[in-house]
């Protein structure tokens, strides 16, 4: 089943490299497992940045070699990718996925477009 | 460096499937992301997918997205790439991949330091 899925058009990464930004969903129901997927729409190609799965009211629970951080808040997912570079410019986007209890349902976000710009390098004192 | 060896490869019709599959050695495979490319002839090599060393997040070209499916078995040190409706443009040298780096945003641009010595797809019309 369909599910409606928010997030930001565009986000602005930090210079240290982090982007943060919320996604939200219209939960149908009262789901207590709920499955986050960011994912990178970009250079004609599709990846799982990141994956959390999270009991209601419990901290988000990343997979190994995640670059991301997240906190949950009622139907509001706060995330967090750390550690980018301006190659690293592109469409993400939220897919939540709601596992327990039935039915299914998944709702895939219009993705928010993260800009992140390379800090300028500091110039030599004399 | 770890050691892999491709097999599965073939001539297949159109619409037809083939699972590749990398067999790994010499070093723990689980420490590396595992990627598969492919090489047409007189083309560039290409990125076709990867796995990251749980096996948990994945990565796709557009063009095999919802066709090809890619796998991994620590346990066993192997490695797959599933590939269903497959069509002539699919046709090359498809080459197993390692790379000794954690996941990240552009898996297509890690820099993999083994590589497997390919095996042949033919999709005919």
């Known amino acids: 089943k369909a599910m409606h899925v928010a997030q930001p058009a565009v986000v602005l990464a930090s210079s240290r490299g982090i982007a943060s930004f919320v996604c939200e969903y219209a939960s149908p129901g009262k789901a207590t497992e709920v499955r986050v997927t960011v994912l990178r729409q970009a250079d004609s190609q599709v990846t799982e940045v990141c994956a959390a799965t999270y009991m209601m009211g419990n901290e988000l629970t990343f997979l190994d070699d995640s670059i991301c951080t997240g906190t949950s808040s009622g139907n509001q997912v706060n995330l967090t990718i750390q550690g980018l570079r301006a190659m690293d410019t592109g469409l993400y986007i939220c897919k939540v996925e709601l596992m327990y209890p039935p039915p299914y349902y998944l709702g895939i976000g219009n993705g928010t477009q993260i800009y992140v710009i390379d800090p300028e390098p500091c110039p030599d004192s004399d | 460096e770890v050691q892999l060896v491709e097999s599965g490869g073939g001539v297949v019709q159109t619409g037809g499937s083939l699972r590749l599959s990398c067999a790994a050695s010499?070093?723990?495979?689980?420490?590396?992301?595992m990627g598969w490319f492919r090489q047409a002839p007189g083309e560039d090599r290409e990125f076709v997918a990867a796995?990251?060393?749980?096996?948990?997040?994945?990565a796709y070209a557009d063009s095999v997205l919802g066709r090809f499916t890619i796998s991994r078995d620590n346990a066993n040190e192997m490695a797959y790439l599933q590939m269903n409706s497959l069509n002539p443009e699919d046709t090359a040298v498809y080459y197993c991949?390692?790379?000794?780096?954690?996941?990240?945003?552009?898996?297509?641009?890690?820099?993999?330091?083994?590589w497997g010595q390919g095996t042949q797809v033919t999709v005919s019309s």
């Open positions: 010499g070093r723990t495979f689980s420490m590396y992301t």
């Open positions: 796995i990251s060393r749980s096996g948990g997040l994945k």
């Open positions: 991949a390692a790379a000794p780096v954690p996941w990240g945003t552009r898996p297509s641009h890690f820099t993999y330091d083994s």
